[in-house]
Amino acid sequence: KSSSEATNITPKHNMKAFLDELKAENIKKFLHNFTQIPHLAGTEQNFQLAKQIQSQWKEFGLDSVELTHYDVLLSYPNKTHPNYISIINEDGNEIFNTSLFEPPPAGYENVSDIVPPFSAFSPQGMPEGDLVYVNYARTEDFFKLERDMKINCSGKIVIARYGKVFRGNKVKNAQLAGATGVILYSDPADYFAPGVKSYPDGWNLPGGGVQRGNILNLNGAGDPLTPGYPANEYAYRRGIAEAVGLPSIPVHPIGYYDAQKLLEKMGGSASPDSSWRGSLKVPYNVGPGFTGNFSTQKVKMHIHSTSEVTRIYNVIGTLRGAVEPDRYVILGGHRDSWVFGGIDPQSGAAVVHEIVRSFGTLKKEGWRPRRTILFASWDAEEFGLLGSTEWAEENSRLLQERGVAYINADSSIEGNYTLRVDCTPLMYSLVYNLTKELESPDEGFEGKSLYESWTKKSPSPEFSGMPRISKLGSGNDFEVFFQRLGIASGRARYTKNWETNKFSSYPLYHSVYETYELVEKFYDPMFKYHLTVAQVRGGMVFELANSVVLPFDCRDYAVVLRKYADKIYNISMKHPQEMKTYSVSFDSLFSAVKNFTEIASKFSERLRDFDKSNPILLRMMNDQLMFLERAFIDPLGLPDRPFYRHVIYAPSSHNKYAGESFPGIYDALFDIESKVDPSQAWGEVKRQISIATFTVQAAAETLSEVA
């Protein structure tokens, strides 16, 4: 049956009607409205924007729109005592200081409350010492320094370039290496694309531009003071010393003009190879310390930021389902920005706004979705996904019983080359089918489908004629829904050409230069890519909320489970002798995957053939589909990461942004050759294999015939 038949309404209220109502001009207008002043989490400006969105969503026709507030730990620079880094001479005199703020972009010189660049949640401190350059501060970079080059970071201030991995992982690695402070900087090799001018003349990062960002290692905990529970008025709060995920050493970000001044004097060891060298005119020596003439000079950090419990506000809008009001499809994205949020998050928030408007228009004409749709404007995402996590903690019992799907809606663009999708395998077929019905916005693909341009520009590495869909990692608001609660999740945005643009993120990410003009002049003047993303996100929500049978295909999970089992087995097989010595076998896991594949296949046949006019049977089959993602949740969580509970996927322990498959086994195997007690280490591998086997088998059994 078509979606329109689901709620017995006139055929004009179908997916096409919803998609046709979405307008690029509206998205443009909303983006402009959302980006004129900063909307930093915890500020009055962001509260006012929450109230504006609440009011407009009501006008658009949602059944109810509520503000939900929480009191969470946030972090701000000291207004009267700015953060900076100095080069000091032997007398302690400051001979160079890093900048105190970014030069504001033209037209924004008189805007107040632009927060200067800082690393959110850095502790206060004034460490002083020699500098060590640690490349991207990845796990492998510290292995190279400590194991191969025998360089000790203990007591040193490390300087790391942004990119490749989440900044919080960099800080964690530096802490573990014994560093007393961390300086993060944007190297032009990563944030300046060749042949493009810097802002305001192009989309590249100017030398004074700096990337803000939090440096937490929350591992899904939400508010650092109330892990597992909502930060409401009766919440018990931990002391700051017991807070989750806070860094223990001062951290500060700088731009490449300032980095040049610090790096040009570096002495000590030469960089190990070209992968450690950026594009500045400096030697990229590793250190420690400055070269001959400057060897008596040191680096000193001056960090005075404070962490304080602050009120944040989510906006939650409801469009009640006509047939299954107790089944929730959620579309959520954040509202808080570091400064103007031209891309992050407001290019996403503007799309959500237009999607709400379109759904509201249909509702005003008498239509309702089959299932309830919840719309969310999250607060404090930039401070650790706090708004979404606190709301999910507060509503976890409802969500785990009623949550069908979560579609994330942060930045709609990070480039203008092709589509990028990360989602659960359950949604692969939904995404393929939807993109085949949408028109490509790409030049040279006029009259062709989005699926076609996406497949051509971003082909699947495994299956010819299909586009790439990536694993979900973290670093965004789907985290709690997917990794903690096991709700099927997905995200879509327009992205850059990863082949030719090797820089990390987009150059102006989290800087003051992320403005409306950046988007309107350089990324998407016609807002056609924004419109396409609105169609993909909105279309997914429409189908998830309105299809009679949930548009999930469990067979696609079977395919990836086999792929992931092969991958982890191959990693383990790099140690054949130890596998033999400790009797490590993956046979049980492969057997469970085989069982899953067979049961999923039989389930799909039943799904095709059952009587869809029988509401009990329909509900039963849909529940099996809805609860399949939930079946991959281990209530005990992953080792040392209790809020990452999905056994098939977790954020990488070495890069929060990346997804890892069979993470429990992967982490048990990681660097196993260096473990002091190999017997215990291989025992943990065996334990993790057994957990994965049990989970896959248990998930398979949820798809078996009920009686």
Epitope: S99, P104, A106, E109
Partner: nanobody, 123 residues
Amino acid sequence: QVQLVESGGGVVQPGRSLRLSCVASGFPFISYGMHWVRQAPGKGREWVAVISYDGSNRYYADSVKGRFTISRDNSKNTLYLQMNSLRPEDTAVYYCAKERIFGVLTPDDFDIWGQGTTVTVSS
């Protein structure tokens, strides 16, 4: 239009003080490093001092170090030069100048100059 207007010059006795001002208009003052440069009668231009766009760094010519202080008030689009312990050799026309490149400090890369204000140190 883009302009820099200096003021505060005059005739002063050796050992005394003077404060020069330079009001900027027509460009985002807050985003650019600013310099003071001087030209003594019959001589070439001599760089005096520079301040970064945010005031975080200030550098001086050896000839004025410890006596002159460069400062700025971004809310007033104004650059200052406080000159103490003035000497006859400080006699010159003082110009303020704007850095050409947004957000960076260079020793001699200026694109906008004021018309100058004359300082005469004489007993």
